[in-house]
């Protein structure tokens, strides 16, 4: 318990490089006082006192361990933390600086929460801003497309910079963008439609920076459990923030009197917490949390980073997965509520709509359950996960798998049971979505174990890259259109409204079966890669100055 | 179904007020945009006013601007026209409208102004 | 801000078919949905074509809605004309939350 306490103060932020030094060497275990053991996860080593930094390397979700050629293995001692206590090794605060590092991540997951908060509140007025600007159905598209695109392009950019630069300074300074440019656009004129749609495209950009970035600064500041953890909370902030997002822009828009003041409140509150990130999130260093000794070597270029990404098999299946994973969501976001409606149309529980938006109560049911499912799989995921290890390596990619290919039978499931029963399609969009959401913390565990530290943010944002590209981009407009091609060719009549749509979004399942194919093709490759990681890891280490290897 | 019923119009003379209300019932009132639109005697619809779902933004025809107020009641779920200083050009059928997605028209309530 | 152009008048035969166009001055007509309302003589407008194409519950198929983007014009296409197609009508677009009307056509059927 003590070495635990020991380990998890140890593999906190680097507020000072004093505290940083003074920690790297207890974990050589080179003080004389330490008699020959070392404490924090790191095996001491007979004799020599020198604690080679492969010997463990501490990822998202567990702790890997492997022999050094050559040398024998010798457990933790429950006693280390006590054996660091000389005077020659002052011991650090755990409590505080457990504090710090969770309060860190509070406010990284806060600022995720701000991101899609202020990305959904635009949904939540969208008629508002339709009938304001006097704009179609396209054009407040296009302010998705706009800002999906954008985000895109920026995302790879920033992952380059977050490898090589200031992290908590590009996050604050993106966040700040962001909340500027969101909160000039409420002031934007009915004639100038264009503006607002620039202005999405900026806070794309702004909120690229963010979420290619602050997964990495998490995954510098814990290791094992505790990263999946706190990555689970982060990324639960995506359904919490979305949901948010749509009760925020209705109910602002009915307490101020008027739709403008509904972009008004993330802005506020992205100050707060930007200002909050540079003052709380400590500056830490990459791969901290997963170096037992020694400094990372110079950084690679950006194309030798693309090039080992592009040859990483576990990274590019699972990239691939969650392509899928995001086609699915964005399809069934867009398109679910209004199936629904037609499904009651159907049934002649509810009128045919005339005028959108048509299933707004069907949205907010909707979006209640992506909220609660998004916790609900996050967590359950993570369980599942952490249960697995146990019994296998490959637990990871294997329960990502398996949440994807039981997600695809009741997504199936919604489109059988819409025809009778409301009710039913719902508890199969609940079901289906927890198990959807499931591996959304799991993948960025994957990336953790697969990517080496000064890649991370650079593969954050492929990853984030290529699942807009090939995932929520175009799939609402996928459905759309072959919604509209299968009703060219029938009759004119609510049933087949209906099925239409129904058979198009059967396009979904598949897409998601697909997703849970690239899962077990990433636990394939999975060991193997870990395994590469890890020793480039090592490979990245120097060796103290003045300890000879 | 939707259904928008004017009230308060009739003979007024130049220079006085007018306040003309709207009430609305069949859909969410405070969802949508609401506006008034007049139809002078053998002439074509002539837009007047529009405002916001919340109130807060309000927009006029530029020979009534100064002069007509546009303002809604969210929870009496009406819309009203407040028409000073009167002219005889303003003589017309006011009508109010839901003019996003499936418009909808009240039947029209005849403002006379007349000395 | 632009203006829609509508022709005065159009005479048809019974029976044919008519369209009435409704051309935008400046900017594209399809940035704006374009709205159509029939007004008979003494009466409200109703809406027969909202959303450019779309129409509305109770309106006969006969009227369809279309937007050429070759002469930026909105059409309204009335097929099989009958005698209580005889009214006036206008189309409407949006110019931000300012509603446009065209002058209006009086469709007389002979």
């Known amino acids: 318990m003590m070495c635990l306490e020991c380990a998890s103060a140890a593999a906190g932020g680097a507020e000072e490089e004093e505290a940083d030094a003074e920690r790297r060497r207890r974990r050589r275990g080179a003080q004389p006082g330490a008699g020959g053991s070392a404490c924090c996860g790191a095996r001491g080593v007979g004799g020599a006192g020198v604690v080679s930094a492969d010997e463990e390397v501490q990822t998202l979700s567990g702790s890997v361990r492997r022999v050094p050629s050559g040398l024998p293995s010798i457990p933790s001692t429950p006693g280390c933390a006590a054996a660091a206590k000389g005077p020659s090794a002052p011991q650090p605060k755990p409590a505080s600086l457990g504090r710090g590092r969770g309060a860190a991540a509070a406010i990284l997951s806060l600022g995720n929460v701000l991101n899609y908060l202020d990305r959904y509140t635009v949904a939540g007025v969208l008629l508002d801003i339709q009938q304001h600007f006097g704009v179609k159905d396209r054009g407040a598209g296009l302010l998705q497309s706009v800002f999906i695109c954008s985000f895109m392009v920026a995302a790879p950019i920033f992952g380059y910079l977050g490898d090589r630069f200031n992290r908590k300074v590009i996050l604050s300074c993106g966040i700040f963008f962001w909340s500027a440019v969101t909160f000039s656009s409420s002031f934007i004129p009915q004639q100038y439609f264009w503006l607002l749609v620039l202005s999405r495209g900026l806070v794309g950009i702004g909120e690229a920076s963010y979420s290619t970035i602050a997964p990495t600064i998490i995954g510098d500041l814990f290791t094992k459990n505790t990263r999946t953890l706190m990555l689970s909370v982060f990324y639960f902030a995506i359904p919490l923030g979305s949901g948010l997002g749509y009760i925020t822009g209705s109910s602002v828009k009915q307490a101020a009197g008027d739709w403008h003041w509904a972009l008004r409140v993330s802005p506020v509150l992205g100050m707060i917490t930007g200002t909050l990130i540079l003052i709380l999130v400590p500056a830490t260093k990459r791969g901290h949390a997963d170096q037992l000794g020694g400094q990372l070597k110079a950084r690679t270029s950006w194309l030798r980073d693309m090039k080992a990404l592009i040859r990483n098999r576990s990274y590019v299946f699972s990239s691939l997965a969650t392509s899928a994973v995001s086609f699915a969501t964005g399809a069934l976001g867009m398109w679910i509520p209004l199936y629904l409606h037609r499904a009651q149309v159907v049934q002649k529980t509810a009128e045919t709509c005339n005028s959108p938006p048509c299933g707004a109560k069907d949205s907010l049911i909707f979006g209640a359950i992506t909220c609660f499912t998004g916790f609900l799989g996050v967590v359950t995921g993570a369980g599942a996960t952490r249960w697995c290890r146990l019994r296998t390596q490959r637990a990871d990619p294997l329960v990502c798998a398996v949440g994807m290919l039981g997600s695809a039978i009741f997504i199936c499931l919604i489109f059988v049971a819409a025809k009778t029963s409301i009710v039913g399609a719902y508890i199969c969009i609940f079901v289906g979505e927890t198990l959807l959401f499931s591996n959304w913390a799991i993948t960025a565990d994957i990336l953790m174990y697969v990517v080496i530290p000064t890649r991370r943010a650079t593969a954050v944002a492929l990853q984030s890259f290529t699942s807009h590209l090939l995932g929520d981009a175009g799939s609402p407009y996928l459905i759309g259109f072959i919604s509209d091609l299968i009703r060219q060719s029938t009759k004119d009549s609510p049933l087949w409204e209906f099925l239409s749509l129904g058979y198009a979004l059967m396009l979904c399942p598949f897409v998601v079966v697909l997703g849970g194919m690239f899962f077990l093709a990433t636990a394939l490759f999975f060991l193997s890669d870990r395994a590469k990681a890890e020793q480039q890891v090592n490979q990245l280490v120097m060796p103290p100055a003045s300890v000879k290897v | 179904e939707v259904h928008l019923v004017e009230s308060g119009g009739g003979l007024v003379q130049p220079g006085r007020s007018m306040k003309l209300s709207c009430t609305a019932s069949g859909f969410t009132f405070n969802n949508y945009y609401m506006a008034w639109v007049r139809q002078a005697p053998t002439k074509g619809l002539e837009w007047v006013a529009s405002i916001s779902t919340g109130g807060g933004y309000t927009y006029y025809r530029d020979s009534v601007k100064g002069r007509f107020t546009i303002s809604r009641d969210n929870t009496g779920n009406t819309l009203y026209l407040q028409m000073d200083s009167l002219r005889s050009e303003d003589t017309a059928t006011y009508y109010c409208a839901r003019c996003w997605e499936l418009p909808y028209w009240g039947q029209g309530v005849m403002v006379t102004v007349s000395s | 801000q632009f203006v829609l152009t509508q022709p005065n008048s159009v005479s048809t035969n019974l029976g044919s078919t008519v369209k009435l166009s409704c051309r935008r001055s400046?900017?594209?007509?399809?940035?704006?949905?374009v709205n159509w309302y029939r007004q008979h003589e003494g009466r409200s407008p109703t809406t027969m074509i909202y959303?450019?194409?779309?129409?509305p519950d109770g309106v006969p198929n006969r009227f369809s809605g279309s937007i050429d983007r070759s002469s930026n014009s909105a059409l309204l296409t009335i097929n099989n004309v009958r005698p209580e197609d005889e009214a006036y009508y206008f189309c409407q677009s949006y110019s931000g939350s300012i509603y446009i009307f065209g002058g209006g056509t009086k469709l007389t059927v002979l």
């Open positions: 959303r450019d194409d779309t129409r």
């Open positions: 400046s900017g594209n007509i399809g940035n704006n949905y």
